[in-house]
Interface confidence: low
C-alpha cells in the first residue's frame, strides 16, 4: 500500500537524510531525487540509482523529493491583481506579487489579492505600507479612521465608534441622527 501521509514522514525518517524507504521493500533506502526532477522508478536495490527524470516544461519540484509527478507551475491570479515576479523553472515555482505601492491581503494561506496602499490623506503615516500590510494612518484633528481612510468628523454619527475621536465636533452636527437616539 502507498503509506498514509503521516506514516510516510515517519517511514522516511528510518533512512538517512536524502534517502527514502522503498515502498515495496522496507529494507532498501533509495536516494531521493534532486530538485528539478521527480521519481520515475524506485531504485532496484541497495546502492543502486533511483530513476529520476527532469520536470517537463510547466512543472517543477523545489526540493529533493520522491514525488511521482512534478508539480504544475502556478499561474499568477490576474483577477486578484497579481503580477509575475519571476517565471517558473524546473526547480522553482512561479513567484507572484503585487505592483509598487500595493500590498498583499491574504484571503487564505495560498491566495492573496493586491490592494493599493493607503495614502493617509487628511492624516499622517504611522507605519509605512509593507508587503503584507497596508499603511497604518493617524488622522488629523477633525477626522476619524474608517477602513484605513481619514474621514471628516461631519460624517460621524453618535451610534458609531468615532464619537470619542470626534467629540468636540459632534456637538455641532445637527439633524444627522434619528430622533430616538441619545
Amino acid at each position: 500500500l502507498v503509506p498514509h501521509l503521516g506514516d510516510r514522514e515517519k517511514r522516511d525518517s528510518v533512512c538517512p537524510q536524502g534517502k527514502y524507504i522503498h515502498p515495496q521493500n522496507n529494507s532498501i533506502c533509495c536516494t531521493k531525487c534532486h530538485k528539478g526532477t521527480y521519481l520515475y522508478n524506485d531504485c532496484p536495490g541497495p546502492g543502486q540509482d533511483t530513476d529520476c527524470r527532469e520536470c517537463e516544461s510547466g512543472s517543477f519540484t523545489a526540493s529533493e523529493n520522491h514525488l511521482r509527478h512534478c508539480l504544475s507551475c502556478s499561474k499568477c491570479r490576474k483577477e486578484m491583481g497579481q503580477v509575475e515576479i519571476s517565471s517558473c523553472t524546473v526547480d522553482r515555482d512561479t513567484v507572484c506579487g503585487c505592483r509598487k505601492n500595493q500590498y498583499r491581503h491574504y484571503w487564505s494561506e495560498n491566495l492573496f489579492q493586491c490592494f493599493n496602499c493607503s495614502l493617509c490623506l487628511n492624516g499622517t503615516v504611522h507605519l509605512s505600507c509593507q508587503e503584507k500590510q497596508n499603511t497604518v494612518c493617524t488622522c488629523h484633528a477633525g477626522f476619524f479612521l474608517r477602513e484605513n481612510e481619514c474621514v471628516s468628523c461631519s460624517n460621524c454619527k453618535k451610534s458609531l465608534e468615532c464619537t470619542k475621536l470626534c467629540l468636540p465636533q459632534i456637538e455641532n452636527v445637527k439633524g444627522t441622527e434619528d430622533s430616538g437616539t441619545t
Epitope: L5, E9, L67, H69, L71, S72
Partner: nanobody, 119 residues
Framework: EVQLLESGGGLVQPGGSLRLSCAAS????????MGWVRQAPGKGLEWVSQ????????YYAHSVKGRFTISRDNSKNTLYLQMNSLRAEDTAVYYC????????????WGQGTLVTVSS
C-alpha cells in the same frame, strides 16, 4: 470558489464494477494533478490514485493496481475512477482531491461518495 462534486458511489456485489465521477469547478482544472483518496469505516485515509494535469502519467496504490483506472476529461473538467473486480475491502468513502504535492497534498476535497461492496 473551488468545488469538487463526486458521484457514482453505491452498493455493489463483490466482483462488480462502479465508475466514480468528480465534477470540478472554480479553478483551472487543466493546471492541476488530481487524485482519489478513500477512507474505510474507522480507518485513516488511503491514497488510491493520482493523474497528472495532462493525463500522461498515472499512479495507483498497490491495493488497487490492475483493478482501478483513473482518467480525466479536461474539456469537461471531470475526473473519473473506473473500479472493477471490487472487493469488500474497497468499501469506503471516496474523495476526489486536487493534488498539490505538499505534505498536506490534497488542498481541496470533495464531500465524498460512499462505495459499499457487499453480497
Amino acid at each position: 470558489e473551488v468545488q469538487l462534486l463526486e458521484s457514482g458511489g453505491g452498493l455493489v456485489q463483490p466482483g462488480g464494477s462502479l465508475r466514480l465521477s468528480c465534477a470540478a469547478s472554480g479553478f483551472t482544472f487543466l493546471k492541476y494533478s488530481m487524485g482519489w483518496v478513500r477512507q474505510a469505516p474507522g480507518k485513516g485515509l488511503e491514497w488510491v490514485s493520482q493523474i497528472s494535469n495532462t493525463a500522461d502519467r498515472t499512479y495507483y496504490a498497490h491495493s488497487v493496481k490492475g483493478r482501478f483506472t483513473i482518467s480525466r476529461d479536461n474539456s469537461k473538467n471531470t475526473l473519473y475512477l473506473q473500479m472493477n473486480s471490487l472487493r469488500a475491502e474497497d468499501t469506503a468513502v471516496y474523495y476526489c482531491a486536487i493534488y498539490t504535492g505538499r505534505w498536506a497534498p490534497f488542498e481541496y476535497w470533495g464531500q465524498g461518495t460512499l462505495v459499499t461492496v457487499s453480497s
